[in-house]
Interface confidence: low
């Protein structure tokens, strides 16, 4: 069946050195355990994290993300996943694309990560 992929509408903010979580889900929600799920970085499509055949595919990951990512799958049965990136770097700033692939059907959603220097960050308000 067909579905849409939904990511955060607004840029997600993180401080250098912190962890950040990028949520992504399909609508209508359904079990995505058997799907291929992943994040890559446009425009050059470097793989940030890939989940396929029921497990994380570390071998496909871009070197700069090895050991820094974790796919939170506790709600994958409802079609919801979250990518956690540890030790955020300035180079992580920019676009990420999340995708779900069910056999030959694939949909994607774009999201933006803003990375800020903790020494110059002022909380809004």
């Amino acid at each position: 069946g067909q579905f849409r992929v939904i990511g955060p509408r607004h840029p997600i903010r993180a401080l250098v050195g912190d962890e950040v979580e990028l949520p992504c889900r399909i609508s209508p929600g359904k079990n995505a355990t058997g799907m291929e799920v992943g994040w890559y970085r446009p425009p050059f499509s470097r793989v940030v994290h890939l989940y396929r055949n029921g497990k994380d595919q570390d071998g496909d990951q871009a070197p700069e993300y090895r050991g820094r990512t974790e796919l939170l799958k506790d709600a994958i049965g409802e079609g919801k996943v979250t990518l956690r990136i540890r030790n955020v770097r300035f180079s992580d700033e920019g676009g990420f694309t999340c995708f779900f692939r069910d056999h030959s059907y694939q949909e994607e959603a774009a999201m933006e990560l803003k990375v800020e220097d903790p020494f110059y960050w002022v909380s809004p308000g």
């Epitope: 499509s45 871009a62 676009g95 694309t97 959603a109 774009a110 933006e112």
Partner: antibody, heavy 116, light 107 residues
């Protein structure tokens, strides 16, 4: 069905300007990075520029840096390439391409001829 | 920039032949290697991405292999519609770079 339709090509004198457009349909345009790739007559493919889905990232080939500007209007599902200070060596068919894992869909191309 | 070198630059083959095209990168690009087919007057078409993944709708006679610096595109049984020019492309690093192309002609 994914469709990419380029327009705006034509004959221009050296030093002149052109703006190429690429109208996209059949996919969620705002979810994808987009690129321009060119092909000089009888030659191979050369990447020109890319832009991220929100437009916050742009990249350019050294051969066009400072002369070309890539942009997009997600509300119009349209990709642009503003080309200034054109040179004879910019003569080529310009293709827009959708970025997935690779350039997974291409337009039919628009010919840019730079000649006096 | 990463240089991509294809060989041969052209080849002649017959329908039913097994055809192999190689692509070498000037430095390791992991599996960030894609293959495209282009026919005269037409836009390129993606065949293989990530070195070995077959793009949706592409016939299974096309296959890709390799990692690091050496890659191969194989057409297991050449069909009349396969006569075209084939390009490899790396998207490991900016700028994306293409091979110079391999023209597959009818023998």
């Amino acid at each position: 069905e994914v469709q990419l339709l380029e327009s705006g090509g034509g004959l221009v004198q050296p030093g002149g300007s052109l703006r190429l457009s690429c109208a996209a349909s059949g996919f969620t345009f705002s979810s994808y990075a987009m690129s321009w790739v060119r092909q000089a007559p009888g030659k191979g493919l050369e990447w020109v520029s890319s832009i991220s889905s929100y437009g916050s990232y742009t990249g350019y080939a050294d051969s066009v840096k400072g002369r070309f500007t890539i942009s997009r209007d997600n509300s119009k599902n349209t990709l642009y390439l503003q080309m200034n200070s054109l040179r004879a060596e910019d003569t080529a068919v310009y293709y827009c391409a959708k970025n997935g894992y690779a350039f997974d869909y291409w337009g039919q191309g628009t010919l840019v001829t730079v000649s006096s | 920039d990463i240089q991509m070198t294809q060989s041969p630059s052209s080849l002649s083959a017959s329908v039913g032949d097994r055809v192999t095209i190689t692509c070498r990168a000037s430095q390791s690009i992991s599996s960030y290697l894609n293959w495209y087919q282009q026919k005269p007057g037409k836009a390129p078409k993606l065949l293989i991405y990530g070195a070995s993944a077959l793009q949706s709708g592409v016939p299974s006679r096309f296959s890709g292999s390799g990692s690091g610096t050496d890659f191969t595109l194989t057409i297991s049984s050449l069909q009349p519609e396969d006569f075209a020019t084939y390009y490899c492309q790396q998207n490991d690093a900016s700028p994306n770079t293409f091979g110079q192309g391999t023209k597959v002609e009818i023998k």
